[in-house]
């Protein structure tokens, strides 16, 4: 199953993320799930994940830095939290889960760029 | 003539980049001419050029915003004052300017991203 | 570090049942999908069945659809294939292994026999 | 369900030697295809993932190249360790499934 990515994203100066991942799905779904994996050197690590139902929205765990939606078979991720040592490459992932058969989906990765602000001068 | 830049360049919070341009000399150049274009779309427009001779100091224009220092055949540039809107692809061009033959060399180019930041809040 | 380790086999009678376990252990065990692939004597590797994450969604190869079934206890690491109506053809080596993020199966147990005779 | 057809069923070569095995794909899997190699009595182990990504702790003389229905696993250099069962696999969709494998061994 094809999955689009944009290939570059900067962070904002807040560390914030956003990108678009897309997903060309080859049946009718109603459970999929979207994971954010990082990928440094040879290493890939989840970042986070969630399972959705078609038409339902993208629930994260409390605890993630992840948030999103969907809409049809795109899903907008939002990363927050992200310092310059977070500079990485970030794959999308998404499973068809139901109904059978599943299928699994790759992108091909979105190198996200982090700069750690300058501190602001201390008030007088 | 071959020249080698890094391909991609984070700017810093503080608008400043900087990255490296090597070139292969062909022959023993005493006078070379280094010139950083940017590239956005199709049009291609110089940021800041200088001249200098082999083993002395690089030295750009007072009002220009490159710095620069040079080792052999390796030339440390640096930009400043940049802004986000300032992101794009900044190509190193290298000239042999003296003695004759004129050889001249340019780079793939290398992406400077550039994030603004946030504005600290007003001191009371 | 990662470990997969079955138990569970030996031999049994034909259309009588048997229960493997599959003990994780070293990783997040309910970030990873867990396969069983089988291996008969001298043959080639055979996919028997998948579960996923939370467990509530499962695979299996026709088979053994009807007679198997894969499931698992987050809280414990196991993973689990209740084997029911066995047959001749059931006899093999009975793998688990972890799905890496990726999708391929990038850990695997070193197995457990599974002998049905009369 | 997707068929997996390697090729050849054996391969006879001697230490050194280069060692080239196909698996072609009933249908496209796109890039999710793995390589496992299998010693006599003991679970397969990834080598190639993705098509062509080797697995963590895999010598770089083990290649993967193709995508579609078209796939190579090329051993550059036979070592004496390689001599075993390579099988690929499909994970891009269930059923999931293996080919039925290539022995390679020493002529």
């Known amino acids: 199953m094809h999955v689009a990515q944009p290939a570059v994203v900067l962070a904002s100066s807040r560390g914030i993320a956003s990108f678009v991942c897309e997903y060309a799905s080859p049946g009718k779904a109603t459970e999929v799930r979207v994971t954010v994996l990082r990928q440094a050197d040879s290493q890939v690590t989840e970042v986070c994940a969630a399972t959705y139902m078609m038409g339902n929205e993208l629930t994260f765990l409390d605890d993630s830095i992840c948030t999103g939606t969907s809409s049809g078979n795109q899903v907008n991720l939002t990363i927050q939290g992200l310092r310059a040592m977070d500079t990485g490459l970030y794959i999308c992932k998404v499973e068809l889960m139901y109904p059978p058969p599943y299928y699994l989906g790759i992108g091909n990765g979105t190198q996200i760029y982090v700069i750690d602000p300058e501190p602001c001068p201390d008030s007088d | 003539m071959h020249v080698a830049q890094p391909a991609v360049v984070l700017a810093s919070s503080r608008g400043i980049a900087s990255f490296v341009c090597e070139y292969a000399s062909p022959g023993k150049a005493t006078e070379v001419r280094v010139t950083v274009l940017r590239q956005a779309d199709s049009q291609v427009t110089e940021v800041c050029a200088a001249t200098y001779m082999m083993g002395n100091e690089l030295t750009f224009l007072d009002d220009s915003i490159c710095t620069g220092t040079s080792s052999g055949n390796q030339v440390n540039l640096t930009i400043q004052g940049l802004r986000a809107m300032d992101t794009g692809l900044y190509i190193c061009k290298v000239e042999l300017m003296y003695p004759p033959p004129y050889y001249l060399g340019i780079g793939n180019g290398t992406q400077i991203y550039v994030i603004d930041p946030e504005p600290c809040p007003d001191s009371d | 570090q990662v470990q997969l380790v079955e138990s569970g086999g030996g031999v049994v009678q034909p259309g009588r049942s048997l229960r493997l376990s599959c003990a994780a252990s070293?990783?997040?065990?309910?970030?990873?999908?867990i396969h069983w692939v089988r291996q008969a004597p001298g043959k080639g590797l055979e996919w028997v069945a998948v579960?996923?994450?939370?467990?509530?969604?499962?695979d299996y190869a026709d088979s053994v659809k009807g007679r198997f079934t894969i499931s698992r206890d987050n809280s414990k690491k196991t993973l689990y294939l209740q084997m029911n109506s066995l047959r001749a053809e059931d006899t093999a080596v009975y793998y688990c292994?972890?799905?890496?993020?990726?999708?391929?199966?990038?850990?695997w147990g070193q197995g457990t026999l599974v002998t049905v005779s009369s | 369900e997707i068929v997996l057809t390697q090729s050849p069923g054996t391969l006879s070569l001697s230490p050194g030697e280069r060692a080239t095995l196909s698996c072609r794909a009933s249908?496209?899997?796109?890039?999710?295809l793995a390589w496992y190699q299998q010693k006599p009595g003991q679970a397969p182990r990834l080598l190639i993932y993705?098509?062509?990504s080797r697995a963590t702790g895999i010598p770089d003389r083990f290649s993967g190249s193709g995508s579609g229905t078209d796939f190579t696993l090329t051993i550059s250099r036979l070592e004496p360790e390689d001599f075993a069962v390579y099988y690929c696999?499909?994970?891009?969709?269930?059923?999931?499934?293996f080919g039925p494998g290539t022995k390679v061994d020493i002529k």
């Open positions: 579960i996923w994450y939370d467990g509530r969604n499962k």
């Open positions: 993705g098509a062509s």
């Open positions: 070293g990783f997040t065990f309910s970030s990873h999908g």
């Open positions: 292994a972890r799905v890496a993020p990726l999708g391929p199966l990038d850990y």
């Open positions: 696999q499909q994970y891009g969709r269930s059923p999931f499934t």
């Open positions: 249908q496209s899997v796109s890039s999710y």
